[in-house]
């Protein structure tokens, strides 16, 4: 071409009719005028759809690629059963990396870039309707949903997208039910859906499958009052519309079938992108035909990237932008409501938000009030945890029933069967078996069930934990364990246990008003002041006792020898008198011990002068020893008191941890969280972390066994334990005051009534009665003012 001639850029198109081909040519002319560039001249080259894939691929090669087209526009074929006619266009052009712009093709398979690597489109795939459903769920506060999807690419794509959106909101479908495409029997599946709590059914299916679902749903009375059916465009089209229930809410992509509008917008996008592309360097021309040509168009991937990043603001169909899969973003939908077999627009989705027109909506069953989206399931799954006196767990009798027992008031203990692990000790095999649960919380549950008219099945938490957030496999993702985890995952509908209300938990679950107000306290072993039988030895060290013992015998021997051999030992005043005998060894021993032990000795004293001198010295020494011993013994008996008890959370032994004084709490409990979260308690937490126990029962036993010096736990539990186990005592002021509440999911229909029932129970004295029955009765004498006594221990 001459230097001043514009560069001819061919744009190809595969369109539905000759009329649309004419529109395409007009759109290209308009684009040329709009850009008014003397450098580039766009040229339209088009064909209409061919009856089969081979002919279509050949036509793309012979009529379009042979013209060195930079891009190919392709509309969705007019025949509804011939779904994949854009496929040969996509495959053929894609092989050479020539971008293909779909105009009205909605199937999600075209988003798969490993198959359709050069495919973009000015419409969104059907799976993007999930964004509208999700937004409608938000607008109408529907949290319980059932997702009913065909088990094909379309259904799975819609499911995946909706689940991703729900995950961001930390929510999930109550159930995802899949059916085989083309199935004629979905009754069993819908029966399963009917049993669930959710009443919002989101359906993603082909026209024919949707019709099958609607027919079965009508037979099962699942299309009347209380139900909500949210569907897409296919599900309110053609055959599906004949069977769709009144009140259904469906979607229609605005301008979705307006091929001429999409031709205009696609040409506008391509024209804009071509001008951008040709400003770049090293641009190669597209291939000329397919015969003998296996090389890709080198600039093709670059041109596709330019197209994908295009922003065409003033499109006939609104603003045209593409996501990373080449799918249209910010598409607008009409929200349609089937009323008396007519589709009525009752809202709009403007690309980001749903704007409903509630006045116009007629809900299933002819209702004008928005359905709440769930049915109150009257059989609740209750999770609890072994924590006396709130929940006692005992094995069942051989016949599977619970042993009859009586409370301190003489009333029979109300027991319920609760399934759970039969052994919580680590390392032992755990089997889920029926057991008997009773206690404060069980009485409360029975009362709630009676006043609120629900039935229940109780199970013990599988991992034996109350619930904390833990990292999953060292990732940043955190998941709740314990009762919290079971509640949030739907394994339980309600936590009825001494679950501490705290902020971290309250962000994820709904707590009732507290049924028990309490705090944290410290459990220690009670030190009974007593002195052992060997305490009389304490005033002297063993070496001194040894020396005293040795001295007694050495003195005795010395006395004996002096008395026996001293020349001055004997003299006669007169010879007739009988001579006094010298000290025998035994009388010397008697004298020596007698002087020491201060017994008056009337006989057997030394006779010789030297022995008497030694005796006097020994007597003086004995006097000092005895006086010292007596004074020391008195002092020791006075001071022989047990070590001072812990004064509370600020006790130096807790604040300045050492291995001499071990204290702990229960792993992954609210107390654990409390110490972990409080910066000023971090030193304590580091000490506790190493020593924490799996359960409160284990920790209490460890205190009794002197393996643990102090156990920090809920005051209600510890005060009860101290009142039952007389060797234990709680100490210090309560700290971190809190309460126990019943846990429910945020969307629980029961939350209001549970709180009201608990408040009533406080008012009418029922909680006070439970407290007296289970928590406050005393087994041990609380007085501790006995004197120190000697014992054999």
């Amino acid at each position: 071409r001459a230097a001043c001639d514009p560069k001819i850029v061919n744009i190809g198109a595969v369109l539905s009719t000759r009329k649309h081909e004419q529109m395409f040519r007009e759109a290209v002319n308009q684009a040329n005028k709009r850009h008014g560039s003397w450098k580039i001249q766009l040229n339209a080259t088009s064909v209409t759809h061919k009856p089969n894939a081979i002919q279509m691929a050949l036509s793309v090669c012979e009529d379009l690629i042979s013209s060195q087209v930079y891009a190919i526009l392709v509309s969705h074929p007019p025949t509804p059963n011939d779904h994949f006619t854009p496929t040969p266009v996509s495959y053929t052009a894609g092989f050479y990396r020539i971008p293909v712009l779909g105009l009205t093709t909605r199937m999600s398979i075209y988003s798969d870039k490993s198959i359709h690597l050069s495919f973009l489109r000015t419409v969104p795939p059907y799976s993007h309707q999930s964004s509208v459903w999700f937004e409608m769920m938000r607008v109408y506060s529907w949290n319980h949903i059932i997702l009913l999807v065909s088990d094909d690419h379309e259904g799975r794509a819609a499911q995946k997208r909706l689940e991703t959106l729900l995950e961001e909101r930390e929510s999930k479908a109550e159930k995802v039910l899949q059916f085989d495409p083309g199935t004629k029997n979905v009754t069993a599946l819908l029966m399963e859906a009917k049993e669930l709590e959710a009443r919002v059914i989101i359906l993603s299916a082909s026209e024919d499958d949707a019709a099958t679902v609607y027919r079965a749903a009508a037979m099962l009375n699942m299309t009347g009052s209380g139900y909500v059916w949210l569907v897409g465009e296919r599900e309110i089209s053609g055959n599906a519309l004949r069977y769709a229930p009144d009140g259904i809410l469906g979607l229609q992509l605005i301008n979705g079938k307006n091929e001429s509008a999409h031709i205009s917008d696609a040409v506008g996008v391509v024209a804009q992108a071509v001008h951008e592309l040709l400003e770049k360097e090293n641009i190669t021309d597209p291939p000329r035909g397919c015969v003998g040509n296996t090389n890709i168009w080198k600039t093709g991937p670059l041109f596709k990237r330019v197209l994908m990043s295009s922003k065409y603001a003033d499109g006939v169909t609104g603003r045209v932008e593409f996501n990373e899969d080449g799918d249209r973003k910010f598409a607008n939908y009409s929200i349609m409501n089937l009323q008396n077999r007519k589709l009525v627009q009752v809202g709009i989705y403007n690309g980001t938000h749903v704007i409903p027109n509630d006045r116009k909506i007629i809900w299933p069953g002819g209702e004008t009030e928005k359905p709440r989206g769930y049915q109150m399931s009257t059989r609740l799954k209750i999770v609890t945890i072994h924590q006396e006196p709130f929940v006692y767990v005992k094995p069942t009798l051989s016949d599977g029933t619970c042993k009859e027992e009586f409370t301190v008031n003489g009333d029979p203990v109300k027991k319920v069967i609760c399934t759970g692990p039969n052994d919580t000790s680590p390392g032992s095999p755990r089997h889920t078996v029926p057991q008997c649960c009773y206690g404060f919380c069980i009485d409360l549950l029975i009362k709630l069930a009676r006043t609120m008219n629900f039935t229940y099945e109780v199970h013990l938490v599988a991992d034996g934990k109350f619930g904390t957030q833990e990292r999953v496999n060292n990732s940043n993702k955190k998941e709740w364990n314990g009762m919290m985890g079971e509640l949030l995952s739907g394994q339980a509908d309600m936590i009825v246990a001494p679950l501490t209300i705290n902020n971290e938990r309250a962000q994820y679950i709904e707590f009732s008003k507290p049924f028990k107000y309490q705090g944290l306290t410290i459990l220690v072993k009670k030190e009974i002041p007593r002195s052992t039988l060997d305490s009389f030895m304490q005033p002297f060290q063993s070496t001194l006792w040894l020396l005293v013992g040795l001295s007694v015998h050495v003195v005795a021997v010395m006395l004996y020898l002096l008395d026996r051999f001293s020349p001055f030992g004997r003299f006669k005043v007169n010879s007739e008198e009988e001579e006094e005998d010298a000290l025998t060894l035994s009388s010397a021993m008697w004298f020596s011990w007698g002087v020491l032990l201060n017994s008056g000795i009337g006989e057997g004293a030394p006779r010789s002068f030297s022995a008497r001198i030694l005796g006097m010295v020994w007597a003086g020494f004995a006097m000092i020893i005895v006086a010292s011993y007596t004074a020391n013994l008195a002092a020791f008996l006075v001071l022989d008191r047990p070590e001072e008890r812990i004064t509370g959370i600020n006790d130096p032994r807790l604040r300045n941890p050492s291995d001499k004084f071990i204290y702990a709490t229960v792993k992954q409990s609210s107390v654990d969280i409390y110490f972990r979260r409080q910066v000023e308690l971090s030193t304590m937490y580091r000490h506790m972390e190493k020593h924490n126990y799996e359960s409160a029962a284990e920790a209490i036993q460890a205190v009794r066994d002197n393996k643990l010096h102090a156990f920090i736990w809920d005051s209600a539990v510890l005060e009860f334990e101290a009142s039952q186990k007389c060797d234990l005592v709680t100490t210090g002021e309560l700290f971190f005051r809190s309460g126990f509440g019943i846990g429910m999911r945020k969307d629980s229909p029961w939350k209001q009534n549970v709180s009201l029932s608990i408040l009533k129970s406080h008012e009418n004295g029922f909680m006070e009665d439970l407290d007296k029955t289970w928590v406050r009765y005393q087994e041990c004498d609380s007085r501790s003012n006995a004197p120190a006594t000697l014992t054999f221990e």
Partner: antibody
Framework: QVQLQESGPGLVKPSETLSLTCSVT?????????WHWIRQPPGKGLEWIAY???????DYNPSLKNRVTISRDTSKNQFSLKLSSVTAADTAVYYC????????????WGQGTLVTVSS | DIQMTQSPSSLSASVGDRVTITCRAS??????LAWYQQKPGKAPKLLVY???NLADGVPSRFSGSGSGTDYTLTISSLQPEDFATYYC?????????FGQGTKVEIK
Amino acid sequence: QVQLQESGPGLVKPSETLSLTCSVTGYSITSDYYWHWIRQPPGKGLEWIAYIRYDGRNDYNPSLKNRVTISRDTSKNQFSLKLSSVTAADTAVYYCAREDYGSSSFDYWGQGTLVTVSS
Amino acid sequence: DIQMTQSPSSLSASVGDRVTITCRASENIYSNLAWYQQKPGKAPKLLVYAATNLADGVPSRFSGSGSGTDYTLTISSLQPEDFATYYCQHFWDSPPTFGQGTKVEIK
């Protein structure tokens, strides 16, 4: 062919109740559609008053709500309007119309009846 | 209530002229708009529904366009029978309200 015909007194005294009836031929008012009353004061624009649906539910213009009652007589295939405590400002041509709620439009109208409020 | 403002309130035109009447809503009505023609002493007659769709039996010289808050009724070639008052009306919210009307007169 659907036809709507308004009927009622042409003159009403102030503070009295205005009563109008719309007779529908060629279509059952219980089968489908919304059935409306609209008025037009002389030389002025159109003002919507109320509707009754095929299933008997209704809706009123908030500015007239406490004075308006709409009802139907299915045996006669008629629907009626009652407007209480009328004043001279209620003088208007009163039309009944059918709304095709699928296309959101009044596709059939009666020819209108002039009601004058005067003592 | 959503207010509908028509302009102009009246216009003079000759047979064969292209006439454009606009209607602005006080908020987005999402194409829930109808146009009516009313001749003196007669009931209004539906011309266009859903902003762009021509009602049955309405000549093709009438067309509707617009979206959001701004809508237009166009008569491509004015005919003698087209001299009348034209009203727009929204159906988005309750109550449905009408524009004040545009009177098309012979020049």
